[in-house]
Interface confidence: low
Amino acid sequence: MMTGTIETTGNISAEKGGSIILQCHLSSTTAQVTQVNWEQQDQLLAICNADLGWHISPSFKDRVAPGPGLGLTLQSLTVNDTGEYFCIYHTYPDGTYTGRIFLEVLESSVAEHGARFQIP
């Protein structure tokens, strides 16, 4: 039975050329996280494997940094980065949990974080 829940940064916005942290947090489960995949719509951005560490997709290597934690930092944002991002937690024995973040990249300086990640 899957009892866990994923908290995310929710809907966020950022300025073109800036950076943003995509953050998910899995709670309410004792399942072991074996791998976290970060995907943008149908593209794989990065993988964080518990044993092997981080792998960043070659096409995103220049603009994606691993962390903080199991999160992902997107740099040098462009308007084309606007869209849905998914954190996919592979766990044992629960299975797969998925969190969704919507990022809007704005041209002007009106960008504000739509939601804050809760720090314990």
Epitope: Q23, H25, C48, A50, G53, W54, A65, P66, G67, P68, G69, L70, G71, T73, Q75, F117, I119, P120
Partner: nanobody, 118 residues
């Protein structure tokens, strides 16, 4: 056991500068992040800046161009250079370390108070 010790806080006038230091022990600053959070009275703790062992950095929009985070990997120490300080930068500043796997920002320092006032 991970230990983080901050120093460098204090009282500074608006427009002034401070440099915070965070000395870490109990882990190797490798495949990890170190960062600075701050918490003003009545507000949530917020991430101000973070840096990887590889030198990748993150800044909150409110401090971009004014604050600079850096690290000396050999000393396991992170620094936060704060310039052009504003009264709204007044807060307790916490150093945090995240050893890449597990809970996010699970290791915290005790905090150092920065007061920006004339």
């Amino acid at each position: 056991e991970v230990q983080l010790v901050e120093s460098g806080g204090g009282l500074v006038q608006p427009g002034g500068s401070l440099r915070l230091s965070c000395a870490a022990s109990g882990f190797t600053f490798d495949r990890s992040w170190m960062g600075w959070f701050r918490q003003a009275p009545g507000k949530e703790r917020e991430l101000v800046a973070a840096i990887t062992s590889g030198g990748s950095t993150y800044y909150a929009d409110s401090v971009k161009g004014r604050f600079t985070i850096s690290a000396d990997n050999s000393k396991n120490t992170a620094y936060l250079q704060m310039n052009s300080l504003k009264p709204e930068d007044t807060a307790v500043y916490y150093c945090a370390a995240d050893v890449w796997y597990g809970s996010t920002w699970r290791n915290w320092g005790q905090g150092t108070l920065v007061t920006v006032s004339s």
